[in-house]
């Protein structure tokens, strides 16, 4: 199922139930999000205006989706899995009597369950799990997620120690030699390697220890921060940069006009909303696009996807996956795959990992 592809997630309370004080609603919702942030790398922040990832709504009857509420009892609430628009939103039936305690329906407990759905969890068959489909009051002061809930959410997002790998909320320059440093995208550009992270990129000139940090906007003012994938076709002096469902073409280090364009022009199906990583192999003249736990192969000569894709990363790149953050091609036989703070040198002729490194090993740390 879908997951959020970022770790900083915003929520907004669209309206308040008259059953409770506003502060109690705010507190119940905040604590419900905290239950999930305590066991994952996710960070939640409340916003009061604008488009949030997760919209919390109290409504009765028909309320703008295909799932009208049914009056008191029955369906208490529902939530949509991660995605744009209605994706992630949590709806609470206003015909219930929402409370901070055991009377009526406890908002905190219901919200923990619904936020689980908002994050991509389905129902659990374990009656002790908060994701079990039926509501049962438990003491909120001693409430704990079950092992099944934790297993489920960590299978989607990992555990909290991955917090250190996240983009800085203040967008300050990441510490280059932080052992937990991860990258958003990596690509060669001629004899240099570009490492992208948030608003920044590091430039590594091959075989030289010195690296310099730059703002992406200082080199390419028209490009966004948070580049998610990148690859180079050196013979054409072209670099492709990807963010969300758009890509930019850089020729001879200059952005081409009439970009960005949609990634769907490569032939991706509509459900692909972003690219995690990409790499061009000049030997085969093919580009590999990594999306979630799958990859596509694109024929750069014929300008079309090869048939038979997508394929599972783990099936065809032994020891890599299920997902990757970045990848680049080097020395005519290696892919360097980045997964969080780890990096894997992968010999594509032998089809195996030949070295495991830290992601920032290129910087003499």
């Amino acid at each position: 199922g879908p997951v959020w592809r970022k770790h900083y997630i915003t929520y907004r309370i669209n309206n308040y139930t008259p059953d409770m004080n506003r502060e109690d609603v705010d507190y119940a919702i905040r604590k419900a999000f905290q239950v999930w942030s305590n066991v994952t790398p996710l960070k939640f922040s409340k916003i009061n205006t604008g488009m949030a990832d997760i919209l919390v709504v109290f409504a009765r009857g028909a309320h703008g989706d295909f799932h009208a509420f049914d009056g008191k009892g029955g369906i208490l609430a529902h939530a949509f899995g991660p995605g744009s628009g209605i994706g992630g939103d949590a709806h609470f039936d206003e015909d219930e009597f929402w409370t901070t305690h055991s009377g009526g329906t406890n908002l905190f407990l219901t919200a923990v369950h619904e936020i689980g759905h908002s994050l991509g969890l389905g129902h659990s068959s374990d009656p002790k799990a908060v994701m079990f489909p039926t509501y049962k009051y438990v003491d909120i002061n001693t409430f704990r997620l079950s092992a099944d809930d934790i297993r489920g959410i960590q299978s989607l997002y990992g555990d909290p120690k991955e917090n250190q790998r996240l983009p800085n909320p203040d967008n300050s320059e990441p510490a280059l030699c932080d052992p937990n440093l991860s990258f958003d995208a990596v690509t060669t550009v001629g004899n240099k390697i570009f490492f992208f992270k948030d608003r920044f990129f590091w430039l590594k000139v091959s075989e030289r220890p010195k690296t310099s940090v730059n703002l992406i906007s200082s080199l390419w003012p028209t490009l966004p921060s948070g580049i998610e994938a990148a690859y180079e076709i050196e013979a054409r002096n072209q670099v492709f940069l990807f963010k969300d469902d758009k890509y930019w073409l850089i020729s001879n280090l200059r952005p081409e006009p009439n970009y960005p364009k949609s990634i769907h022009s490569f032939g991706f199906p509509n459900f692909v909303k972003k690219i995690d990583a990409a790499v061009f192999n000049p030997r085969f003249y093919r580009t590999y696009f990594f999306v979630d736990n799958q990859y596509w192969r694109y024929d750069e000569r014929r300008q079309m996807m090869d048939p038979g894709y997508p394929k599972l990363i783990t099936k065809n790149f032994q020891g890599i996956g299920p997902k990757i953050d970045a990848v680049f091609y080097s020395k005519n036989k290696y892919y360097y795959f980045f997964q969080g703070s780890n990096q894997f040198e992968y010999d594509f002729l032998l089809q195996r990992i030949t070295k495991t490194l830290k992601s920032n090993s290129w910087f003499g740390c």
């Epitope: 309206n15 919209l55 703008g64 899995g81």
Partner: antibody
Framework: EVQLLESGGGLVQPGGSLRLSCAAS????????MSWVRQAPGKGLEWVSR????????GYADSVKGRFTISRDNSKNTLYLQMNSLRAEDTAVYYC???????????????WGRGTLVTVSS | DIQMTQSPSSLSASVGDRVTITCRAN??????LNWYQQKPGKAPELLIY???SLQSGVPSRFSGSGSGTDFTLTISSLQPEDFATYYC?????FGQGTKLEIK
């Protein structure tokens, strides 16, 4: 490439029955909500029915409730609409539409078929 | 029940014009509103979802705005291929449509 191809339309007498099919390809059919939407000649769009990915959850417009039944066969990548007790006002082009979402449906249709014409007349 | 009222029902404009179509719900639908374009004899095509998000492949001259009960679709500079009928939609409810014709 996502493709939806409706079939089964035609001329039928009032009170008669018809079964529409929609063959889907180019996406994982069993992951998505699907809907039928119709358009009477010269009129606007009217949502008719929807079905969840597993087929366990369905919904209908009031105008067809009790007369139409939506179903799907995920092994055949096919969506169906069984239409009984047809009336003149059911005359329309019937479109099969793919919802952008699995699980709960927000009713956002990113792909549509070309439609099949159903004419109810004596 | 939720109802959607679209206006105007028809509109004449020229190539290069800026055009606005509005859609009003009788109760809040948050940002759960979509816009479709339909050309004669063709199936509808998704233009805008979640009130303001542009569907991939749709030209940037199309934009959407609004939340709650009032929504607008704007075409910043009409092109010949934009003459069509436009529908707003929320779950199982469509607006009546706006036919955009050449002046």
């Amino acid at each position: 490439e996502v493709q939806l191809l409706e079939s089964g339309g035609g001329l039928v007498q009032p009170g008669g029955s018809l079964r529409l099919s929609c063959a889907a390809s180019g996406f994982t059919f069993s992951w998505y909500n699907m809907s039928w939407v119709r358009q009477a000649p010269g009129k606007g769009l009217e949502w008719v029915s929807r079905i969840s990915p597993s087929g366990g959850d369905t919904g209908y417009a009031d105008s067809v409730k009790g007369r139409f039944t939506i179903s799907r066969d995920n092994s055949k990548n096919t969506l169906y609409l069984q239409m009984n007790s047809l009336r003149a006002e059911d005359t329309a082009v019937y479109y099969c539409a793919k919802d952008i979402r699995g699980a709960y449906s927000g009713g956002l249709f990113d792909y549509w078929g070309r439609g099949t014409l159903v004419t109810v007349s004596s | 029940d939720i109802q959607m009222t679209q206006s105007p029902s028809s509109l004449s404009a020229s190539v290069g014009d800026r055009v606005t179509i509005t859609c009003r719900a009788n109760q809040s639908i948050y940002t759960y509103l979509n816009w479709y374009q339909q050309k004669p004899g063709k199936a509808p095509e998704l233009l805008i979802y979640a009130a303001s998000s542009l569907q991939s492949g749709v030209p940037s001259r199309f934009s959407g705005s609004g939340s709650g009960t009032d929504f607008t679709l704007t075409i910043s500079s009409l092109q010949p291929e934009d003459f069509a009928t436009y529908y707003c939609q929320q779950a199982g409810i469509f607006g009546q449509g706006t036919k955009l014709e050449i002046k």
